[in-house]
C-alpha cells in the first residue's frame, strides 16, 4: 500500500502466532500489517499472502465479529459469528488493477500510472494528484510558472509544464501549463457578465 507508512507494519515473527486484532499476519515472515492492507491489490507481505483468498473477507480472523470499524469489508452474517442468522459470506473482492495502473486512495478505481501527477485529477478524491513531490521535475516543459502560488483547492493543470521558481508543495502549487486561471472556481451567486 504505497500511501501507508512503513511504521504501520510490525514484526511479530513466524512463530509468535498472533497479531493485534487490527493486524493481519503475513504467512511466511510473520509480519503484522494493518488489516486494511488485506485484499487491497497491493502486495505488502513478501509472500503476497495479504492478497490471497480475497474472494472471502477474513472477517472472522482472530474471532473478531464483526471486525473493528474501518476495515475494508464489513462482515455481514458470517457463519461462525455468534448469534448470526445470515450464513452468507459477503463477497468483498476488489478486482486487481491491471499492470501499469494505480488504485485511487479512497475508492476501488484504477487509473493508468501515466495519469498520476499530470495535473488532472482523475480519482474521485484527487489522490492521483496528491503527494506529487517537492522539486519534482515535470515532463516536456512548454510553460513556466508565473504569478502567485495558489492552494491545493485551486490547483490547475501542471501537465506539460516546467516549474521555475520556488519548489512545488501541496501548500503552494503554482498555476502553470494548460491552466488559464488559478481560481478555485467556487462562488455563491449566479454567474455575472464580465
Amino acid at each position: 500500500s504505497p500511501l501507508s507508512t512503513p511504521t504501520s507494519a510490525q514484526a511479530a515473527g513466524p512463530s509468535s502466532g498472533s497479531c493485534p486484532p487490527t493486524k493481519f499476519q503475513c504467512r511466511t515472515s510473520g509480519l503484522c500489517v494493518p488489516l486494511t492492507w488485506r485484499c487491497d491489490r497491493d502486495l505488502d507481505c513478501s509472500d503476497g499472502s495479504d492478497e490471497e483468498e480475497c474472494r472471502i473477507e477474513p472477517c472472522t480472523q482472530k474471532g473478531q465479529c464483526p471486525p473493528p470499524p474501518g476495515l475494508p469489508c464489513p462482515c455481514t452474517g458470517v457463519s461462525d459469528c455468534s448469534g448470526g442468522t445470515d450464513k452468507k459470506l459477503r463477497n468483498c473482492s476488489r478486482l486487481a488493477c491491471l499492470a501499469g495502473e494505480l488504485r485511487c486512495t479512497l475508492s476501488d478505481d484504477c487509473i493508468p500510472l501515466t495519469w498520476r501527477c499530470d495535473g488532472h485529477p482523475d480519482c474521485p478524491d484527487s489522490s492521483d494528484e496528491l503527494g506529487c513531490g517537492t522539486n519534482e521535475i515535470l515532463p516536456e516543459g512548454d510553460a513556466t510558472t508565473m504569478g502567485p502560488p495558489v492552494t491545493l483547492e485551486s490547483v490547475t493543470s501542471l501537465r506539460n509544464a516546467t516549474t521555475m521558481g520556488p519548489p512545488v508543495t501541496l501548500e503552494s502549487v503554482p498555476s502553470v501549463g494548460n491552466a488559464t486561471s488559478s481560481s478555485a472556481g467556487d462562488q455563491s451567486g449566479s454567474p455575472t457578465a464580465y
Epitope: A99, G100, S107, I111, P121, P124, S126, E153, N178, S181
Partner: antibody
C-alpha cells in the same frame, strides 16, 4: 439518474462575455466526478473547453488561453462557463457533460444551448 | 495536442450494408502500462448531443447494439457497423481520451442512399 441542463443567452455581441449555467440534478457536483464544457461549432467540429473537478480544481484547453473560466455554485448544484472577448468564431452549441469516474470520455450530456455571436 | 483524423468525411450506404470508418491519431493512444487504448466513439443524431458508443477502442457501452464494433490499436482505429439500420444514420466521432486537451475527430457522416 443524473441530468444536466444548460441555460444561457441565445445571442452575444462581439467583444462581450458569455456566461452559461449548467444545472445538475440527481447528483451533487461536490461528491465525485469532473464536470466539463464542450462546444460544437456550426461545421460540427467538437472542442473540449475545460472542467471543474468535484474538489474545485479547474483545468482548461490551452487554445482558449486566458478567455475561459469555469466556476460553480455548490449551494445550487450548478457550474458555469465564462468566456470573455467573444467573436464570431465562438458561435457554437455549448454542452455541459460528465465522464464516468476515473475516465476521460463522456457518457452524460446536457441537451446543449446554442449561442450566436453577432452585432 | 493530439490530432484526430477521421475518414471518410461521409458515407452513403444502403440498409443492411456493412460499413467501416477510420480514425487516426497523431500520437499513440495505447497506454503501454495497462495495454488499454484510450479511444472513444460517439454517435450524434441531428438536434441531439453526442451519445457514447464505444470506449477503450473496443468496449461497447451497455445497451449499444452488437452490430457496432470498435477495433484498432496505437494510432489506427476502426468503427464497423455490421448491418446498417435506418436508425444508425448519424455523424460518428472519435475522441482521444488519453491526454489533455481531449480532442475529437471531425466526424464521419453516415447517409442513406
Amino acid at each position: 439518474d443524473v441530468q444536466l441542463q444548460e441555460s444561457g443567452p441565445d445571442l452575444v455581441k462581439p467583444s462581450q462575455s458569455l456566461s452559461i449555467t449548467c444545472t445538475v440534478t440527481g447528483y451533487s457536483i461536490t461528491s465525485d466526478y469532473s464536470w466539463h464544457w464542450i462546444r460544437q461549432f456550426p461545421g460540427n467540429k467538437l472542442e473540449w473547453m475545460g472542467y471543474i473537478h468535484s474538489s474545485g480544481i479547474t483545468n482548461y484547453n490551452p487554445s482558449l488561453k486566458s478567455r475561459i473560466s469555469i466556476t460553480r455554485d455548490t449551494s445550487k448544484n450548478q457550474f458555469f462557463l465564462h468566456l470573455s472577448s467573444m467573436t464570431n468564431e465562438d458561435t457554437a452549441t455549448y454542452y455541459c457533460t460528465r465522464p464516468p469516474v476515473v475516465t476521460r470520455y463522456f457518457d452524460v450530456w446536457g441537451a446543449g444551448t446554442t449561442v450566436t455571436v453577432s452585432s | 495536442d493530439i490530432v484526430m483524423t477521421q475518414s471518410p468525411s461521409s458515407l452513403t450506404v444502403t440498409a443492411g450494408e456493412k460499413v467501416t470508418m477510420s480514425c487516426k491519431s497523431s500520437q499513440g493512444l495505447l497506454d503501454s502500462g495497462n495495454q488499454k487504448n484510450y479511444l472513444t466513439w460517439y454517435q450524434q443524431k441531428p438536434g441531439q448531443p453526442p451519445k457514447l458508443l464505444i470506449y477503450w477502442a473496443s468496449t461497447r457501452k451497455s445497451g449499444v447494439p452488437d452490430r457496432f464494433t470498435g477495433s484498432g490499436s496505437g494510432t489506427d482505429f476502426t468503427l464497423t457497423i455490421s448491418s446498417v439500420q435506418a436508425e444508425d444514420l448519424a455523424v460518428y466521432y472519435c475522441q482521444n481520451d488519453y491526454t489533455y486537451p481531449l480532442t475529437f475527430g471531425a466526424g464521419t457522416k453516415l447517409e442513406l442512399k
